[in-house]
């Protein structure tokens, strides 16, 4: 025997929406298509997001914080459509949003929880303070706060120094690491879990480059496979460090497929570059050219920085000379 | 089925106060916008006052603007009329109902029975 | 405020016959405009919603028109339970009634 109606207590549709801040999304709502339809958005109960009635918006209660930013798919609403077009959030507009839609045969309440994150591509530094050498993996904004793990030839460090500033809606994080006197290679992984987001730095220091004056040397710089995309546009920079300083010999950018040359002295070959090598050649060597070089492979999910430390000594003329 | 009984009614004297209520049944109580509608004996239906599903919009005819107060308790499926400041053009049934939906659309598949307000001296 | 009009304010028929009620509104409604049937001592009665279209539960008899300023409902013939009095109501802006359109027993 069969009751004559039977109900099944479904709670109300929540979903979760991840949003990146300053850009645009969607909360989603659905509802069976009817008549007389109303559709209200409100954020944590309180606030007024958009409301649609009678064919048309009515934004007259709107709260100021949603102004210009909110929208309807209006050709799609009677197909029962009911989502908002959210643009630009912020931190700020994170929490439960409520769609209220009434037809002429039903009431139906959605519910949307909107998390905001922001992850702006981090970086790897090398920096040298009076004798000491240091890799500093920062990110300048990022939300919620990340996890920063380090490796040393590819065992985890413990040590884990974190420099954090909170501004108003997110983290700026600097994670620094002594490295003085190491030849080891690092690794800098930092995760944005909600975006699923990670980014990697990665360092490497080659072995150091003894030559004459007036010779050339070359310079080892290709991409570890394991990070390094093609497909996804990335800068690399060749620059040498002179009293503490980088100076920038030379950049190519793969969106554009550019090459700018600084240094006279430099080159790069192109089809070498074509096949990912970014090794190049420094002619006429002179004592100045000392130091230290740096090849910056960055993208936005990695940083592959390789060191070399060319020692220009004076050519057997030149000493005799002397 | 959708039940609205409102009750409060009688009579009263002009500058004085009343307060009408209308207990709801048989439906989502806070999905729906609610109103107040009178009539006068003998005469048309004169739209009152309406609240909106979450009592976050009122809106009141120009003829009781200031005088009477609409509101809800949403925990005890009930509607209210407060009336301030009565006078004898106020005397009329009133009906309490239900919007199509939130309230923003204005118009009425259900109603109560009324309950009668009379203001004499 | 916008005033609705109804005419005529009372219309003699008899059963089986066609009637037609006429509602103005003062300005343009689009089409935000209820039709109701009341008979005394009780409450209205939903028949029309958006000018045209029937409420659940009433008789295909009652059909409703009319756009902007100018409506009708229409009764195709009449039944004895249809003699009441007709509202009509714009819901544009707030909501107004009209002063009632009595159909009587000719």
């Known amino acids: 025997i069969f009751p004559l109606a039977f109900f099944i207590y479904v709670p109300m549709n929540e979903q979760i929406v991840i949003g990146r801040l300053d850009e645009d999304i969607i909360l989603p709502s659905s509802f069976e298509r009817g008549s007389e339809v109303v559709i209200h958005w409100k954020y944590q109960d309180s606030y007024k997001v958009h409301s649609y009635y009678k064919g048309s918006d009515h934004l007259e209660s709107q709260d100021p914080r949603y102004a210009n930013r909110t929208s309807l798919f209006y050709n799609e609403i009677q197909n029962g459509n009911a989502s908002l077009f959210f643009r630009r959030v912020s931190l700020l507009d994170e929490g439960i949003y409520t769609c209220y839609v009434g037809t002429a045969i039903q009431v139906i309440t959605n519910k949307v929880v909107l998390k905001v994150g922001v992850f702006l591509t981090p970086v790897m530094k090398y920096e040298k303070r009076n004798t000491n050498s240091f890799l500093i993996c920062s990110v300048l904004s990022v939300y919620p706060r990340p996890i920063i793990t380090w490796k040393m030839d590819n065992t985890p460090i413990s040590e884990n120094n974190m420099e954090e500033t909170g501004s108003l809606d997110s983290f700026s994080i600097n994670s620094p690491l002594n490295i003085t006197g190491s030849n080891s290679s690092y690794e800098c992984t930092i995760e944005n879990s909600l975006l699923k987001q990670t980014w990697t730095g990665r360092w490497t220091m080659k072995d150091g480059l003894h030559k004459m004056q007036s010779e050339h040397v070359s310079l080892s710089c290709q991409p570890v496979n394991d990070y390094f995309s093609p497909n996804q546009d990335f800068k690399v920079t060749w620059s040498r460090m002179k009293s503490g300083t980088f100076s920038v010999l030379a950049y190519y950018l793969s969106s554009s497929q550019n090459t700018i040359i600084n240094e006279s002295r430099f080159s790069w070959n192109k089809e070498l570059i074509n096949q990912s090598d970014f090794s190049m050649n420094l002619m006429d060597l002179n004592l100045s050219d000392s130091g230290e070089y740096l090849c910056n492979i960055s993208s936005d999910e990695y940083t592959l920085l390789t060191i070399h430390t060319v020692h220009v000594e004076p050519s057997q003329e030149t000493a005799s000379h002397n | 089925q959708v039940q609205l009984v409102e009750s409060g009614g009688g009579v009263v004297q002009p500058g004085r106060s009343l307060r009408l209520s209308c207990a709801a049944s048989?439906?989502?109580?806070?999905?729906?916008?609610l109103h107040w509608v009178r009539q006068a004996p003998g005469r048309g239906l004169e739209w009152v006052a309406v609240?909106?599903?979450?009592?976050?919009?009122?809106y009141y005819a120009d003829s009781v603007k200031g005088r009477f107060t609409i509101s809800r308790d949403n925990s005890k499926k009930s509607l209210y009329l407060q009336m301030n400041s009565l006078r004898a053009e106020d005397t009329a049934v009133y009906f309490c109902?239900?919007?199509?939906?939130?309230?923003?659309?204005?118009?009425?598949?259900?109603w109560g029975q009324g309950t009668l307000v009379t203001v004499s001296s | 405020d916008i005033q609705m009009t109804q005419s005529p304010s009372t219309l003699s028929a008899s059963v089986g016959d066609r009637v037609t009620i006429t509602c103005r509104a003062s300005q343009s409604i689009n089409n935000w405009l209820a039709w109701y049937q009341q008979k005394p001592g009780k409450a209205p009665k939903l028949l029309i919603y958006k000018a045209s279209s029937l409420e659940s539960g009433v008789p295909s008899r009652f059909s409703g028109s009319g756009s902007g300023t100018e409506f009708t409902l229409t009764i195709s013939s009449l039944q004895p339970d249809d003699f009441a009095t007709y509202y009509c109501q714009q819901y544009n802006s707030y909501s107004t009634f009209g002063q009632g359109t009595k159909l009587e027993i000719k």
């Open positions: 048989g439906f989502t109580f806070s999905d729906y916008g």
């Open positions: 109902a239900r919007d199509r939906n939130s309230g923003a659309l204005g118009y009425f598949p259900h």
């Open positions: 609240i909106w599903y979450d009592g976050s919009e009122e």
